[in-house]
């Protein structure tokens, strides 16, 4: 039975040209995390494998940095980075847990005027 829950940063915003940390946390389970996949729609950003470390997709190699922890840092943000991001925790014996983060990348002037999402 899957008892775990994923906590995420929820809806977040960041300035164009800046960077953002995508973070998820799996709790309420003793299952072993074997791998965490970070995806945007059907595009892989990165994988953190418990044995093998990080794999960064070549599409994002210039703009993605591993960590902190199992999180992911997305750099040099553009408006096209706006959208849904998913952290997919592969665990044993529970199976797969998925968390969702919505990122909005704002023009600097808009971001300066406090148009922000609330983090739930």
């Amino acid at each position: 039975m899957m008892t775990g829950t994923i906590e995420t940063t929820g809806n977040i915003s960041a300035e164009k040209g800046g960077s953002i940390i995508l973070q998820c946390h799996l709790s309420s389970t003793t299952a072993q995390v074997t791998q965490v996949n970070w995806e945007q729609q059907d595009q892989l950003l990165a994988i953190c494998n418990a044995d093998l470390g990080w794999h960064i997709s070549p599409s994002f190699k210039d703009r993605v940095a591993p960590g902190p922890g199992l999180g992911l840092t997305l750099q040099s943000l553009t408006v096209n980075d706006t959208g849904e991001y998913f952290c997919i925790y592969h665990t044993y014996p529970d199976g797969t847990y998925t968390g969702r983060i919505f990122l909005e990348v704002l023009e600097s002037s808009v971001a300066e005027h406090g148009a922000r999402f609330q983090i739930p």
């Epitope: 595009q43 044995d51 599409s59 592969h90």
Partner: antibody
Framework: DVQLQESGPGLVKPSQSLSLTCTVT?????????WNWIRQFPGNKLEWMGY???????SYNPSLKSRISITRDTSKNQFFLQLNSVTTEDTATYYC??????????????WGQGTSVTVSS | DIVMTQSHKFMSTSVGDRVSITCKAS??????VAWYQQKPGQSPKLLIY???YRYTGVPDRFTGSGSGTDFTFTISSVQSEDLAVYYC?????????FGGGTKLEIK
């Protein structure tokens, strides 16, 4: 370039253990690669069996988990496959292969030439 | 386990033709797909990783595309030396699995 060479007996009796060695040259198995065993059955189906990481931790295909062990000898730059309780269904060509996980994920970019193993009494 | 299905076991083509081989995953695997070429009597050789990236030294007539569940491997102008079996493989999560292979035959 990394070179991999499989070796081991070509014939194994049913219920016995199959033991194969992969000798690696051109790279240290304690560096940042992962070291895999893959087999190819008659008829060409490929099956990933498992890997041992550069730190020595192993991951196995659940279909083999109760029978398989992958270990290494860092002093000889070799890694090993042991498959217990073999049956005729384990007749295959066995390959060792490596990958650079950071760059290529699980895409295996260097392979040995393979060694054929027949299970028969 | 994720099943990778290559619907065509054989494909026949002529030198100079364009040929596409398809691979379908039983569930979404993002872009974690590799393609290999295996010539008779040889071990598999990596051609494509991350669904669409050519491995070092691979001729540009070989391309890959797709994401999610549907993937395509294309040879833009088939050469006689391309006679081989082509396999897809996912590495979304372990166990990594391969397609059954598509044998390319030259007319």
């Amino acid at each position: 370039d990394v070179q991999l060479q499989e070796s081991g007996p070509g014939l194994v009796k049913p219920s016995q253990s199959l033991s194969l060695t992969c000798t690696v040259t051109g790279y240290s198995i304690t560096s940042d690669y992962a070291w895999n065993w893959i087999r190819q059955f008659p008829g060409n189906k490929l099956e990933w069996m498992g890997y041992i990481s550069n730190s020595g931790s192993a991951s196995y295909n659940p279909s083999l988990k109760s029978r398989i062990s992958i270990t290494r000898d860092t002093s000889k730059n070799q890694f090993f496959l042991q498959l217990n309780s073999v049956t005729t269904e384990d007749t295959a060509t066995y390959y060792c292969a490596t990958l650079i996980y950071y760059d290529y994920g699980g895409a295996m970019n260097f392979w040995g030439q393979g060694t054929s193993v027949t299970v028969s009494s | 386990d994720i099943v990778m299905t290559q619907s065509h076991k054989f494909m026949s083509t002529s030198v100079g033709d364009r040929v596409s081989i398809t691979c379908k995953a039983s569930q979404g695997v993002s872009t974690t797909v590799a393609w290999y070429q295996q010539k008779p009597g040889q071990s598999p050789k990596l051609l494509i990783y991350s669904a669409s990236y050519r491995y070092t030294g691979v001729p540009d007539r070989f391309t890959g595309s797709g994401s999610g569940t549907d993937f395509t491997f294309t040879i833009s102008s088939v050469q006689s030396e391309d006679l081989a079996v082509y396999y897809c493989q996912h590495y979304y999560s372990t166990p990594w699995t391969f397609g059954g292979g598509t044998k390319l035959e030259i007319k």
